[in-house]
Amino acid sequence: KFSKQSWGLENEALIVRCPRQGKPSYTVDWYYSQTNKSIPTQERNRVFASGQLLKFLPAAVADSGIYTCIVRSPTFNRTGYANVTIYKKQSDCNVPDYLMYSTVSGSEKNSKIYCPTIDLYNWTAPLEWFKNCQALQGSRYRAHKSFLVIDNVMTEDAGDYTCKFIHNENGANYSVTATRSFTVKDEQGFSLFPVIGAPAQNEIKEVEIGKNANLTCSACFGKGTQFLAAVLWQLNGTKITDFGEPRIQQEEGQNQSFSNGLACLDMVLRIADVKEEDLLLQYDCLALNLHGLRRHTVRLSRKNPIDHHS
């Protein structure tokens, strides 16, 4: 309950708030959990604590880990945990699932996209906004304070939006980017960037050698009839058929279902007579539609035999 996930990109600023709240007068101590080492408060350090905030200016991949914050008052102490992950910058345009903030929905009447976490930073307008890596241009887009307004929203406006701004700390500038998906609500139905429900990203599935195994790729695409939506499996990044292993087959056709009113599809990958070499493969569940493609990777591991010793 009092643990919070935070993430950022290397060489960008990242500011994390302690998940335990307290009055401004309370002191907050920060520690790096693995070593129990205290985080300094001096601003000359690249990573330093500033009351409720933990600042990485800029962040490095090696900063990843769990940080403990203790809010101290005259009568009690409250402990919180910040699970921080710093990722390497992607060379391509795709924003991976793990860098995405919560999805927001808009409609023709209300199409505000707030820049995630921006209130933690010392920034000045204007914000820069990008959709699928392209800078947003044209009179339909208005950067207003900490949010983007889109006029005359259409279903094609759904996608991944990135805000970019500069955090200023004692005269030094640091870049920050944050991305979230935007979906368009429409009475007739709408389409959104695929959301994979299963498998989880980098899931490890336990299988028994010699037995059959099934993997299900399941994703949702929006409401109503979906255009160009599909789920499929790939092996080591190639088509199942190109891989040429007859024991591993994708089911013909995909099953349609509905979850919370959303149109979802699933596709089963069947592995007959699981072999040791199957554990070395990368199984990719792909969900795609007109907005783009999302990929979750699964690997297999050997299920340990049940220990019968007392």
Epitope: A230, L232, K239, T241, Q250, E252, G253, L288, G292
Partner: antibody
């Protein structure tokens, strides 16, 4: 090895019909969509339509609607394309091309060798 | 119907050259674009699917990029066997349509 083998060349008179076959081997026949694409001499590629061998459903380009019929025979892993009311401008090489599901993502990755159809009086 | 316009319609290049072919769609087609190579008297061969994915068995000197309406096929270092005609094709909306082709000739 996935292969598509088409029937031999045809010479037809204007107004006649031609039926070209495309036999698939090396994969699950019903697991691949089959397109028909033609190429007139010295010209580019033109899509005619698609058949899903699994259910037999078809989609034809408007230009060929009413003149083209695509069918399949799952027992012999063969798809057929019949074009009726032939005219001289139908002279072309006709290709069958396979696409794995979903065809709009994967493109046409297996092609037959082509069947030359000549329409001449 | 969605129109696909390729440019140039032909080009002359030497072995080792970097070659770029562009394809423009008359409307947004997302990333549902494929590239093919065709040699005289032969069937086309798929090189790139979904705008940027390299088809299995195709040399890595071929690459594709772009989304929306503008797409590019790049051959990083032209080889003797690459002299052929190249076509783009959209699969966003039936009828599927091809570009007019780009003939790559020996300089």
């Amino acid at each position: 090895q996935v292969q598509l083998v088409q029937s031999g060349a045809e010479v037809k008179k204007p107004g006649a019909s031609v039926k070209v076959s495309c036999k698939a081997s090396g994969y699950t026949f019903t697991g691949q969509y089959m397109h028909w694409v033609r190429q007139a001499p010295g010209q580019g590629l033109e899509w005619m339509g698609i058949i899903n061998p699994s259910g037999g459903s078809t989609s034809y380009a408007q230009k060929f609607q009413g003149r083209v019929t695509m069918t399949r025979d799952t027992s012999t892993s063969t798809v057929y394309m019949e074009l009726s009311s032939l005219r001289s401008e139908d002279t072309a090489v006709y290709y069958c091309a396979g696409s794995y599901y979903p065809y709009y993502y994967y493109g046409m990755d297996v092609w037959g060798q082509g069947t030359t159809v000549t329409v001449s009086s | 119907d969605i129109q696909m316009t390729q440019s140039p319609s032909s080009l002359s290049a030497s072995v080792g050259d970097r070659v770029t072919i562009t394809c423009r769609a008359s409307q947004n087609i997302g990333y549902f674009l494929h590239w093919y190579q065709q040699k005289p008297g032969k069937a086309p061969k798929l090189l790139i699917y979904a705008a940027s994915s390299l088809q299995s068995g195709v040399p890595s000197r071929f690459s594709g990029s772009g989304s929306g309406t503008d797409f590019t096929l790049t051959i990083s270092s032209l080889q003797p066997e690459d002299f052929a005609t190249y076509y783009c094709q959209q699969s966003y909306s039936p009828p599927l349509t091809f570009g007019g082709g780009t003939k790559v000739e020996i300089k």
